[in-house]
């Protein structure tokens, strides 16, 4: 009889075991285990009748189509075999064990005791057949195995071979190299590769196979396994395989498809091809006069581009438009996209106008082309070029006038300062105790008129100032402080300020320049209680033209000591000139006591200690600070007075040979102007040089040489 066994392990014993088995008995055990397992059989006890070639009693182990072993007896002899320690392994998942005893047994034989178990098959080690083994990596597990692929490969649907995804390769460059995947290593199996060469219309693709060409083939059938096909429009070239590469192919098309197919077997190294675009040839090019073309080639084909440029100092001219370079291109029909342009000499055109300056041409015919030269100069004697610049500009290759120091920036004509058009007389007679000034003697002198219409009734007063540049007036802060009913420092509105320059006689303003204010700047620390920091600036709405009657005064060097004691200075103004009029009378009578003609006086600087002492001896707050100095005579008689406020106290600087503003008329008192031992007090300008330059928006270093020349 037959016993079916499906367990993963078990025990098989001869009938009656451990007693002797009966005669004339036959039992078959069919053992089946799952796929991926084999069966291992071994015997713990074996005692059968011995016979030649096991003819009588035996145990036969077999598979469906193969006898694995036949055992009998007790000991192995030449003609009979006992299992002993031997293990029987089935090749597959099925094993059949048959026990047979004949009709007679001369002795009692105890039979056998066998055990079986399912054991895992290591398919990775045992698969020799290429058709069944993994292409790249094999992974065994109990009851089975699986395959995997190297990086960049994909497992085929057969779960065994490794293919690549190579159906999406687009080539758009004019030249390139295409290879089979992994070249020169063997190409992957089960793959369909598609390579597209897509160039611009007008190009034609030429193919050339190189180096190794090795695609699996067949001796009789053309390329049944692996192959290359080349598709050009509707036409298909190939298939190609074997070890002989195809001849170079001229496709006559700008669009080419290369198909490469591999089946699931074989180890071939693949292929490599280079492609290049061919196009129509364009005519030879001649560079323009004073120019060149790049790149310079013997031949130019479709899509080649050349850049036309000109020598230094020349510009490309195309259709009356100037440019630095011009590009032309070889077209698909073999013509150039444009004619070669010409090279035209750079023209800097008419140079920019220089404010307060002139231009002279150094080159004949007033040429403005490349390397031409011009010279800027300032309107002397009223303006001088900043930093003593040469003023020489050359027409550069870029088409701009260039100066070695300033580059493309124009020079600056700064107003000359401290040089009156007529010399001040050395002898000044004994403003109070002064004398009439000749026109042009104090060209920096400004009359500042303030008409405060925000007050009821309208307030009107005047003061003096000093021209520092074409746009700025220096004066005392108290002149430009709103004459309020309290001691708050608030500047007057710029709308209420008018400045007169070049004025000699206040009755005749026709020859004077009058200007409104763009800004009124009081020193931020101006103190109304003691007139400390009594300094201010007015920026004019428009720069004033300089001339013999309108010229700036120079600012001093930054020196805290201020003017040296006993130095003589000049001060001018339209203030009270009559020593018999009292200050109270002036205050009550408004502007009627103004002097018609500009007056001036020569006064010595008073030692600081002497001045301080003279004021400290008075009752009231008469402090003379380090930001002030005094000038005048002990005996009186000559002084500045009300209405001269803000005017410049100028001293001649021997070093620079210029007049420098050292002081601004600030205050005095309490006695009448010109009284004995009542010195005029002036703002010490040298303490404020930095502040002045800062407000005017010029760094001091730029203009310092004004008083150093």
């Amino acid at each position: 009889h037959t016993v079916e066994l499906n367990n993963m392990f078990g025990q098989i014993q001869s009938p009656g075991y451990p007693d002797s088995y009966p005669s004339d008995s036959e039992v078959t055990w069919n053992i089946t285990v799952p796929d991926g397992f084999r069966i291992k059989l071994y015997f713990m006890h074996f005692n059968l009748e011995s016979s030649y070639l096991c003819e009588y009693d035996y145990v036969k182990v077999e598979t469906e189509d193969q006898v694995l072993a036949t055992f009998c007896g007790r000991e192995t002899t030449d003609t009979e075999q006992t299992p002993g320690q031997e293990v029987v392994l089935s090749p597959g998942s099925f094993m059949s064990i048959t026990f047979r005893s004949d009709f007679s047994n001369e002795e009692r034989f105890t039979g056998f005791d066998a055990h079986y178990m399912a054991v895992d098959v290591d398919e990775c080690k045992e698969r020799e057949d290429e058709e069944l083994s993994c292409d790249h990596y094999c992974h065994n597990y109990i009851g089975g195995y699986y395959c995997s692929c190297r990086f960049g490969y994909i497992l085929h649907t057969d779960n065994r071979t490794c293919r690549v995804e190579c159906s999406d390769n687009l080539f758009t460059q004019r030249t390139g190299v295409i290879t089979s995947p992994d070249f020169p290593n063997p190409y992957p199996k089960s793959s369909e590769c598609l390579y597209t060469i897509e160039l611009e219309e007008g190009f034609m693709v030429n193919l050339q196979f190189e180096d190794i060409f090795d695609i699996e083939d067949h001796p009789e059938v053309p390329c049944p396994y692996d192959y290359i096909k080349i598709k050009v429009g509707p036409k298909v070239l190939g298939p190609f395989c074997g070890e002989k590469a195809p001849e170079p192919i001229s496709t006559q098309s700008h669009s080419v498809l290369i198909l490469f197919h591999s089946d699931n077997s074989g180890e071939n190294r693949g292929w490599r091809l280079s492609y290049r675009a061919a196009g129509n040839e364009c005519p030879e090019l001649q560079p323009p006069v004073h120019g060149k073309i790049e790149p310079s080639q013997a031949k130019y084909f479709f899509k080649d581009q050349v850049l036309v440029s000109c020598d230094t100092g020349y510009k490309v001219l195309k259709d009356n438009v100037e440019m630095d370079t011009f590009q032309i291109e070889c077209l698909k029909d073999g013509t150039w996209s444009n004619k070669i342009p010409t090279c035209k000499i750079v023209d800097c055109r008419a140079p920019g106008e220089l404010e307060h300056g002139l231009i002279t041409f150094s080159t004949r015919n007033n040429l403005t082309t490349y390397k031409s030269e011009i010279k800027y100069s300032c309107q002397e004697p009223y303006y001088k070029m900043l930093n003593n610049n040469t003023g020489i500009y050359t027409c550069s290759a870029q088409g701009v006038w260039m100066n070695k120091v300033l580059g493309r920036s124009l020079p600056t004509c700064l107003p000359e300062c401290g040089q009156p058009s007529r010399s001040l007389p050395s002898l000044v007679k004994r403003i109070i105790g002064g004398r009439n000034a000749e026109p042009g003697l104090f060209p920096w002198q400004a009359l500042i008129v303030v008409e405060d219409t925000s007050r009821v009734p309208n307030d009107k007063w005047f003061g003096s100032g000093a021209l520092l540049s074409a746009s700025w007036i220096l004066t005392a802060a108290h002149v430009l402080r709103s004459q309020r009913r309290d001691t708050t420092v608030i500047p007057v509105s710029k709308e209420h300020v008018t400045v007169y320059l070049g004025l000699h006689d206040v009755r005749d303003k026709s020859g004077a320049v009058n200007s409104s204010a763009a800004r009124v700047v009081l020193h931020p620390d101006f103190n109304i209680q003691n007139y400390n920091h009594d300094i201010a600036l007015v920026q004019l709405q428009e720069p004033v033209p300089l001339g013999p009657h309108v010229m700036p005064v120079c600012l001093p060097r930054l020196e805290p000591e201020g003017p040296a004691p006993h130095m003589l200075g000049l001060v001018a103004g339209w203030g009270i000139s009559n020593p018999n009029v009292t200050v109270d009378e002036i205050i009550s009578s408004g502007t009627r006591t103004l002097s018609d003609v500009l007056q001036y006086v020569k006064l010595p600087v008073v030692p600081h200690a002497e001045c301080k002492t003279s004021y400290e001896s008075r009752s009231g707050n008469y402090s003379v600070t380090e930001n002030m100095f005094c000038a005048g005579y002990y005996e009186g008689g000559k002084d500045t007075c009300l209405g001269d406020s803000g005017g410049a106290f100028v001293i001649f600087d021997d070093l620079s040979q210029r007049w420098v503003v050292q002081g601004l008329v600030s205050w005095g008192g309490p006695e009448e102007c010109g009284s004995k031992q009542v010195y005029g007090v002036y703002t010490k300008v040298s303490n404020y040089v930095d502040w002045v330059w800062e407000q005017m928006g010029l760094p001091q270093s730029v203009v310092e040489p004004q008083v150093e020349r």
């Epitope: 925000s454 009821v456 108290h478 004459q483 309020r484 009913r485 309290d486 001691t487 708050t488 608030i490 509105s493 109304i528 209680q529 003691n530 007139y531 200050v583 205050i587 009231g620 707050n621 008469y622 205050w667 008192g669 309490p670």
Partner: antibody, heavy 114, light 112 residues
Framework: QVQLVQSGAEVKKPGASVKVSCKAS????????INWVRQAPGQGLEWIGW????????KYNDKFKDRATLTVDTSSNTAYMELSSLRSEDTAVYYC???????WGQGTLVTVSS | DIVMTQSPDSLAVSLGERATINCKSS????????????LAWYQQKPGQPPKLLIY???TRESGVPDRFSGSGSGTDFTLTISSLQAEDVAVYYC????????FGQGTKVEIK
């Protein structure tokens, strides 16, 4: 013509704050200062502070400098006086004046009562 | 701080008579540079804001009748109403503007 129009009367609890407005017209607001003065019922005038709209400069009476805040909005030509931590003795009419006291607002009565 | 003291606290004057109010400051209000005394006089009628009469101690505000005059310098100042009118009944204040602002306590002027 020049006019200063103040906001209406306010009743506040002790500890609260009050903000009085003063809208100017008829002159250039930024060219002059605004003063604030108060007058308690039956009492004299007491200066609070001063503001200059052109640059937001302020000056305060020491008595009020920790509690009063003066501000301006030049876009609407309006000045403001805010008084914080109110107490009953802050009950007063609050005036604004401009152009150096030539023009005055009509006054705003602020009553501080619990 | 500058302290301002007015005298008398109240004053009764017959119509057409002169009325004089004094004001004393704790320090000089004369600025030696501008040569001005920073003192002003105000008139306040019931329910109205103050009205500026005099500034710089003696300058009359525009539109103020010339019966009002101011005098004094330094620390002592006077407001004079040369001929009292019925409409002059009010409280008068002096104010210093030399250093910030301080008002006097006020002087009440009535008709006798």
């Amino acid at each position: 013509q020049v006019q200063l129009v103040q906001s209406g009367a306010e009743v506040k609890k002790p500890g609260a704050s009050v903000k009085v407005s003063c809208k100017a017209s008829g002159y250039t607001f930024t060219t002059d200062d605004i003063n604030w003065v108060r007058q308690a019922p039956g009492q004299g005038l007491e200066w609070i502070g001063w503001i200059y709209p052109r640059d937001d400069r302020t000056k305060y009476n020491d008595k009020f400098k920790d509690r009063a805040t003066l501000t301006v909005d030049t876009s609407s030509n309006t000045a403001y006086m805010e008084l914080s931590s109110l107490r009953s003795e802050d009950t007063a009419v609050y005036y604004c004046s401009s152009l150096e006291d030539t023009y005055w607002g009509q006054g705003t009565l602020v009553t501080v009562s619990s | 701080d500058i302290v301002m003291t007015q005298s008398p606290d109240s004053l009764a004057v017959s119509l057409g008579e002169r009325a004089t109010i004094n004001c004393k400051s704790s320090q000089s209000l004369l600025n030696t540079r501008t040569r001005k005394n920073y003192l002003a006089w105000y008139q306040q009628k019931p329910g109205q804001p103050p009205k500026l009469l005099i500034y710089w101690a003696s300058t009359r505000e525009s539109g103020v009748p010339d019966r009002f005059s101011g005098s004094g310098s330094g620390t002592d100042f006077t407001l004079t109403i040369s001929s009292l009118q019925a409409e002059d009944v009010a409280v008068y204040y002096c104010k210093q503007s030399y250093n910030l602002y301080t008002f006097g306590q006020g002087t009440k002027v009535e008709i006798k």
